[in-house]
């Protein structure tokens, strides 16, 4: 059974992940982002179901494509800290949160999503899990 300290650690990790995803979304939605229209043409894949930490496997699998799209937006008006580091940090958190005991084959929804929809989906996921822990 999860201890209060492990629950607290999970909560902090989720909050960190949430902040990183929100930072990316804010950068993309920034009215000064000249690349928004182009960035919205890239397709991302969403999980059919995302209700447990193990479902973060579906986020992990889309981090590389996310990094590639973010690389396109590194302009003066779009300030993200080094994309590679940011995605790497997210990846570390995701790996810790989902655990490595069970390898889940992610089931994806049929419809694709824009980068904004994709980020919003995972932000909602983090908020939802955090609310169950508090």
């Amino acid at each position: 059974a999860p201890t209060s300290s492990s629950t607290k650690k999970t909560q902090l990790q989720l909050e960190h992940l949430l902040l990183d995803l929100q930072m990316i979304l804010n950068g993309i939605n920034n009215y000064k982002n000249p690349k928004l229209t182009r960035m919205l043409t890239f397709k991302f894949y969403m999980p059919k179901k995302a209700t447990e930490l193990r479902h973060l496997q579906c986020l992990e699998e889309e981090l590389k494509p996310l990094e590639e799209v973010l690389n396109l937006a590194q302009s003066k008006s779009f300030h993200l800290r080094d994309t590679k580091d940011l995605i790497s940090n997210i990846n570390v958190i995701v790996l810790e949160l989902k655990g490595s005991e069970t390898t889940l084959m992610c089931e994806y929804a049929d419809e694709t999503a824009t980068i904004v929809e994709f980020l919003n989906r995972w932000i909602t996921f983090c908020q939802s899990i955090i609310s169950t822990l508090t």
Epitope: P34, K35, R38, T41, F42, K43, F44, Y45, E61, E62, K64, P65, E67, E68, N71, L72, A73, Q74, S75, M105, C106, Y108, T112
Partner: antibody
Framework: QVQLVQSGAEVKKPGSSVKVSCKAS????????IHWVRQAPGQGLEWMGW????????AYAQKFQGRVTLTADTSTSTAYMELSSLRSEDTAVYYC??????????????WGQGTLVTVSS | DIVMTQSPDSLAVSLGERATINCKSS????????????LAWYQQKPGQPPKLLIY???TGQSGVPDRFSGSGSGTDFTLTISSLQAEDVAVYYC?????????FGAGTKVEIK
Amino acid sequence: QVQLVQSGAEVKKPGSSVKVSCKASGYSITDYLIHWVRQAPGQGLEWMGWIDPEDGVTAYAQKFQGRVTLTADTSTSTAYMELSSLRSEDTAVYYCARSLDYDPIYPFAYWGQGTLVTVSS
Amino acid sequence: DIVMTQSPDSLAVSLGERATINCKSSQSLLRNGNQKNYLAWYQQKPGQPPKLLIYYASTGQSGVPDRFSGSGSGTDFTLTISSLQAEDVAVYYCQQHYVTPPTFGAGTKVEIK
């Protein structure tokens, strides 16, 4: 039709810089990324980096970071690759290339004819 | 960086016979979301730039003869020339287009036996 025409061969001294041009035609240069790939004599292909001519955003291979500069002039539909601190192992054919789609990792469907840069004292 | 390993280094095949080139990547090139493998094949003839033959492991580039086909998934891929023609003499390269930096195999030289 899509065409990428590069500048002519160059002979350079070690320590100097070279600037290769790549003029795009048959499409709007701001619609796609331009990549640079080099090939040493008798060797394989090595990706150097890309530029988005629309806003000058670039990505470089770690190996060339700090030594290569990619720029573009949209008024002349020309992209440039400048490589500094040249050494003999930089002797290669340098290609500009354009992908099939506006995507940093799409494969390269269109290539320039190549520019041979020889570094020799 | 993803390492691409090609085999064999060179290959001599009789005209009209099948030529098979292998390519192995150091990590999977399969994106589960769309079930696509991000691998391309190029042909390069002496003094010419490379020419894109196949991308997404098996999608033929427009104008490429259908004797060229690609297969494989994950980390193991194959380019097949079903019936070798004289004009197919060239060096063939695989390339992953999954992540930056895109990386190439060392090439396979195809000759006529």
